[in-house]
C-alpha cells in the first residue's frame, strides 16, 4: 500500500479551520492479524528525507494524535486532550484520514506529515508517510477561506517506506 496526499499546499487565513487529508491507496490487508497505526506530526523540510523529524502539533506528539484500528475501519480521536488544543484526527472506511485544526494562527504554518504503520502481529512493520505544507496568512491578501493546491501525480503518490 501507499499514502497519497491529495493536496500539497493549504493556504488559509488566520482564525479559519482546516482539514489536512491523506489517503491510503492500494491493497489493504484486512486480516485479523493486521492493524493500522495512523498519526500526524509536524516536521522540518528535510533536504534529504522529508518527514524524518517528528515535531509536535500544538504541543501534542504523534502518540497523542494516533488512530489505531484494522483495515479500512473508521476511527477518530475523541480524547479531550486533542480537542482542547483544537485538533481532531479521523479516519473513514475509504482509506481517507485527516487532521482538523481549528482557529488557525500564524504559528500553525509549516510542514505536516501523515504516517501510516501497518502492523502485522508476529511480523514486521511497514511504514509510509505523506507531506503537505500549511501556510497561514494574515492581512488583505489572505484568502477568505482556505485555498488548496493539488499535488502533482508524482508527489501525491510519493511512497516513503522505512
Amino acid at each position: 500500500f501507499k499514502v497519497a496526499t491529495p493536496y500539497s499546499l493549504y493556504v488559509c487565513p488566520e482564525g479559519q479551520n482546516v482539514t489536512l487529508t491523506c489517503r491510503l491507496l492500494g491493497p489493504v490487508d484486512k486480516g485479523h492479524d493486521v492493524t493500522f497505526y495512523k498519526t500526524w506530526y509536524r516536521s522540518s523540510r528535510g533536504e534529504v528525507q522529508t518527514c524524518s523529524e517528528r515535531r509536535p502539533i500544538r504541543n501534542l506528539t504523534f502518540q497523542d494524535l494516533h488512530l489505531h484500528h484494522g483495515g479500512h475501519q473508521a476511527a477518530n480521536t475523541s480524547h479531550d486532550l486533542a480537542q482542547r488544543h483544537g485538533l481532531e484526527s479521523a479516519s473513514d472506511h475509504h482509506g481517507n484520514f485527516s487532521i482538523t485544526m481549528r482557529n488557525l494562527t500564524l504559528l500553525d504554518s509549516g510542514l505536516y506529515c501523515c504516517l501510516v504503520v501497518e502492523i502485522r502481529h508476529h511480523h514486521s512493520e511497514h511504514r509510509v508517510h505523506g507531506a503537505m505544507e500549511l501556510q497561514v496568512q494574515t492581512g488583505k491578501d489572505a484568502p477568505s477561506n482556505c485555498v488548496v493546491y493539488p499535488s502533482s501525480s508524482q508527489d501525491s503518490e510519493n511512497i516513503t517506506a522505512a
Partner: antibody, heavy 120, light 108 residues
C-alpha cells in the same frame, strides 16, 4: 505610505518604556507589523510581530520581555523593565512585499528607527 | 530556532568587482529567505525576497540564489553606492524570523 517610530529616549534601568509606530497611507488591519532592534554597531534582531488580526507572536528570547499591541493607526512596543542590553535603535516595519501582505516575503516598509538609551 | 549563519563578516572589493555573500540555514527553510541592504544611519532596505526575486527598483547586478539550505547573494559590477552592510533574513516562520549576522561590503 510610511511608518515612523517615536518614544525612544534615555531611561534608567527598570523604568517602563513604550515605543510607538505610526502608520500612514495604509490600514493596520491589512498588514502584519513587526519590531526589529539594532544595538549600536551590531546586527538586526527580530523581536516580534502583530498580525493584521491583532494576534501577537514573539521571538523566543523576547517572550515576556516585550509586549506588542496596536490601535487603528499605531503599533506599540512596551518594554516593561529595560536593561542595558535593551539599548538599541528600534525599527518598526510592515510585513510583506510592496502592497502584498504575504508574510513570507520579508519586511518591506521600514521606519527610520527610534533610539533607546538605558543608563543609570 | 532556525539559526542563520552569514559569511563572510566583511569583504573588500574594487569598483567593478564581484562580491559573494553566503547564508547557511541550520535547517531547511525552503526558499523563504530575504536579503537587505543597510547603510549607516538608515533602516534596512529589502533587496530580494523568496530567495531570488528582486524587489522593484533593485538593479539586476544583485542576484539571489539557493542550493538546499545555503543561500547566496551575488553583487556584480560593484559600485561605490553598494558599500553597505547586507543581511539575510529567514522568513519561514514568525517565530524564526531570524537575521544573519550581517556582512560589511567595502568598495575600494
Amino acid at each position: 505610505q510610511s511608518v515612523e517610530e517615536s518614544g525612544g529616549r534615555l531611561v534608567t534601568p527598570g523604568t517602563p518604556l513604550t515605543l510607538t509606530c505610526t502608520a500612514s497611507g495604509f490600514s493596520l488591519s491589512d498588514y502584519a507589523m513587526t519590531w526589529v532592534r539594532q544595538a549600536p554597531g551590531k546586527g538586526l534582531e527580530y523581536i516580534g510581530i502583530i498580525s493584521a488580526g491583532g494576534y501577537t507572536y514573539y521571538a523566543s528570547w523576547a517572550t515576556g520581555r516585550f509586549t506588542i499591541s496596536k490601535t487603528s493607526t499605531t503599533v506599540d512596543l512596551k518594554i516593561p523593565s529595560p536593561t542595558a542590553e535593551d539599548a538599541a535603535t528600534y525599527f518598526c516595519a510592515r510585513v510583506g512585499y510592496a502592497d502584498s501582505s504575504d508574510i513570507y516575503k520579508g519586511f518591506y516598509l521600514w521606519g527610520p528607527g527610534t533610539l533607546v538609551t538605558v543608563s543609570s | 530556532d532556525v539559526v542563520m549563519t552569514q559569511t563572510p563578516a566583511s569583504v573588500s572589493e574594487p569598483v567593478g568587482g564581484t562580491v559573494t555573500i553566503k547564508c547557511q540555514a541550520s535547517e531547511s527553510i525552503s526558499n523563504y529567505l530575504a536579503w537587505y541592504q543597510q547603510k549607516p544611519g538608515q533602516p534596512p532596505k529589502l533587496l530580494i525576497y523568496l530567495a531570488s526575486t528582486l524587489a522593484s527598483g533593485v538593479p539586476s547586478r544583485f542576484e539571489g540564489s539557493r542550493s538546499g539550505t545555503e543561500f547566496t547573494l551575488t553583487i556584480s559590477d560593484l559600485e561605490c553606492a553598494d558599500a553597505a552592510t547586507y543581511y539575510c533574513h529567514c522568513t519561514d516562520s514568525i517565530i524564526n524570523y531570524n537575521f544573519g549576522g550581517g556582512t560589511e561590503v567595502v568598495v575600494k
